[in-house]
Each structure stands twice: as structure tokens, then as C-alpha cells.
């Protein structure tokens, strides 16, 4: 039995920040679980982890230098990524693992979300006119 995951097909990070919501076909509230967000077609980079246990506070961390936070809903985890760079535009996959009680469960691979990071638009400096020619 696999958990199904739904993600937005595409998100644009205008201010170098984005909320990515992972919606699951599963209630996480009475489970010990590990929700994670992975970058790249091969999911090679683990961007952020949300570890939950019904009796304790959420633990949110990144071991890959991303600035992230996480929020738990009944059947969802929302990852809030900040300080993204333009070159971090990529496809991001939600993953969920239910660790306890047994049996261990995880998800069918989702279609992923393309996060398009747009750099901050800096106002162009006015052109200083050169010295006027007589």
C-alpha cells in the first residue's frame, strides 16, 4: 500500500521564497513520520525534512544548506523555502515515510513541482550623463 501525493505542477518564487504544499492521501496526525522535499529529477538533493511524532513538536531541518520551515496539516505538509537562488530553479519532489506504528509506509513517486526562482528585480541605476561637450 502506497500513499499518494499531490503537488502543484509549477510554482514561481518571486521574492526568492515559496510555499510548497504536499498533500497526502493519508492522515499523519497519529503517526511518527518523516516528510521530505527533494530537488532534481533524480531527487539527489534532500532539501528539507519535517519529522513528526503525534506526541512531540515538529522537527524541521535541512542538511543541504536550504533555508526552510515546515507546517503540518491533517493530510499535508507545507514546506516554506526562503533565500532561493535563480540557479535553484528545478523540479522538487515531496516524499513521505510513515515510520510508526508498523508497517513502514511510503509514497508513490509524485509528478513533482517545478519551482521557478525569479531573481529580485533591482531598479536600474539612472545613466549618468558624461561631461557635456561644448
Amino acid at each position: 500500500n502506497k500513499i499518494l501525493v499531490k503537488q502543484s505542477p509549477m510554482l514561481v518564487a518571486y521574492d526568492n521564497a515559496v510555499n510548497l504544499s504536499c498533500k497526502y492521501s493519508y492522515n499523519l496526525f497519529s503517526r511518527e513520520f518523516r516528510a521530505s522535499l527533494h530537488k532534481g529529477l533524480d531527487s539527489a538533493v534532500e532539501v528539507c525534512v519535517v519529522y513528526g511524532n503525534y506526541s512531540q513538536q515538529l522537527q524541521v531541518y535541512s542538511k543541504t544548506g536550504f533555508n526552510c520551515d515546515g507546517k503540518l496539516g491533517n493530510e499535508s505538509v507545507t514546506f516554506y523555502l526562503q533565500n532561493l537562488y535563480v540557479n535553484q530553479t528545478d523540479i522538487y519532489f515531496c516524499k513521505i515515510e510513515v515510520m510508526y506504528p508498523p508497517p513502514y509506509l511510503d509514497n508513490e513517486k509524485s509528478n513533482g513541482t517545478i519551482i521557478h526562482v525569479k531573481g529580485k528585480h533591482l531598479c536600474p541605476s539612472p545613466l549618468f550623463p558624461g561631461p557635456s561637450k561644448p
Epitope: N1, N27, L28, S30, R31, P102, L105
Partner: antibody
């Protein structure tokens, strides 16, 4: 068809031990938790604990620690509960039940027929 | 541990009437609650899971409601086969305590 077949009634002496069995069929034995429940005459249901045959994971109600021991034999798809140091308080019907996971919500949809244990000298 | 307070302990009603049994917990169990019916000499039968979801094959006169710490089982238009004992059970961690039970008798 999921079936939990429990062993027959037991008449035991105070201080003795008894081992009850719950044989599972109709599903993959190692994929589901089995719960044990006690029902004393004129009283309500009391949760004893659960056993997961896939990893031999166990959870006990603190009240039954030292009283009940849960084990399993994968080859025969059977979960056992041993009760030790029996007293009249242990006279009851004991049920095993399979826990199903309804998308993150648990319940016990399948129950054995129960085993009556009578403690008497 | 979570305490389950089920009420009433017993009630005597006539066929065709409506009854409501309640289960209160001492902390939020986030709808991780099941309801069972048990008849004399038989094994309990699951009626409702996740507080409100009716098990397939259970008549629609049974319904579950509630959230947080307060849950109810309602039986409308009682039939003779509905008489027996009813229990709630939580699955918010262990021990997975049962309520004290409600004995439903024919008036």
C-alpha cells in the same frame, strides 16, 4: 476471507500459566498488527497490547506488563498470548483482533471468536 | 494515558426510537476513534472508524460525529437487532483505551 481462529476454552488453577493462540488466515500475516483485548463478565473491554509479526514489535498496556507476553510463529501465522500468575481477576474472555489502517486512522475490523479462561481451584 | 468517558452506562429504549451515545476524552484525539457493537456471547463488530466513517455493510441508521475531545454515536429508528453493548475506542497512541461501554436494552 480474513479469519482469526482462537484456541479453545481453558480451565486453570490459581498461580498457573496459560498460552492462548490466534491463528490468522486470508491475508499476509507479517503485514498487520494483532491486538489483544480482555472482556470480564459484567465489565467492559480492556486493551492488553499489540504485536506486529513483521518486526516482532510489541506494545503493552502498562497494566498488563508482567502479566501478558505476546509472541508469534510466522511459519504457522499464529500470534500467542501467555498469561502468568493467574488469579480470579484473570477469568475472562480474551479476543485477538486485526488492526487495519484506514488512510492513517486505525480500527479493529476483524476479531477472533474469543477464548474463555476460567481460573479456579 | 488518555481517559475515555462513555455515557450513558445503560439505556432502555423502544424499537423505532433514536439514541445517542457519547464518548469524551481528556485530550484531543483528532478523530482517531472507533465505535463497536457487541452482542452477548459474540465478538465485537466495528461500526465506525475515524469518528465519522461508516464501515461498509453497516446500516445507514448508524452515524458517528464529533471532533477534538467529544464524540457521538447516533442510532436512528432502532431495530431489535441493535440491542447490545456499544464501545468507543481511541487510537491516539497507546494504550488504545476503550470507553466503559453502553448497554442498550429493549424497553
Amino acid at each position: 476471507e480474513v479469519k482469526l481462529q482462537q484456541s479453545g476454552a481453558e480451565l486453570v488453577k490459581p498461580g498457573a500459566s496459560v498460552r492462548l493462540s490466534c491463528k490468522a488466515s486470508g491475508y499476509t500475516f507479517t503485514e498487520y498488527i494483532i491486538h489483544w483485548i480482555k472482556l470480564r463478565s459484567g465489565q467492559g473491554l480492556e486493551w492488553i497490547g499489540w504485536f506486529y509479526p513483521g518486526s516482532n514489535d510489541i506494545q503493552y498496556n502498562a497494566k498488563f506488563k508482567g502479566k501478558a507476553t505476546l509472541t508469534a510463529d510466522k511459519s504457522s501465522s499464529t500470534v500467542y498470548m501467555e498469561l502468568t500468575g493467574l488469579t480470579s481477576e484473570d477469568s475472562a474472555v480474551y479476543f485477538c483482533a486485526r488492526r487495519d489502517d484506514f488512510s492513517g486512522y486505525d480500527a479493529l475490523p476483524y476479531w477472533g471468536q474469543g477464548t474463555m479462561v476460567t481460573v479456579s481451584s | 494515558d488518555i481517559q475515555m468517558t462513555q455515557s450513558p452506562a445503560s439505556l432502555s429504549v423502544s424499537v423505532g426510537e433514536t439514541v445517542t451515545i457519547t464518548c469524551r476524552t481528556n485530550e484531543n484525539i483528532y478523530s482517531n476513534l472507533a465505535w463497536y457493537q457487541q452482542k452477548q456471547g459474540k465478538s465485537p463488530q466495528l461500526l465506525i472508524y475515524a469518528a465519522t466513517h461508516l464501515v461498509e455493510g453497516v446500516p445507514s441508521r448508524f452515524s458517528g460525529s464529533g471532533s477534538g475531545t467529544q464524540y457521538s454515536l447516533k442510532i436512528t429508528s432502532l431495530q431489535s437487532e441493535d440491542f447490545g453493548n456499544y464501545y468507543c475506542q481511541h487510537f491516539w497512541g497507546t494504550p488504545c483505551t476503550f470507553g466503559g461501554g453502553t448497554k442498550l436494552e429493549i424497553k
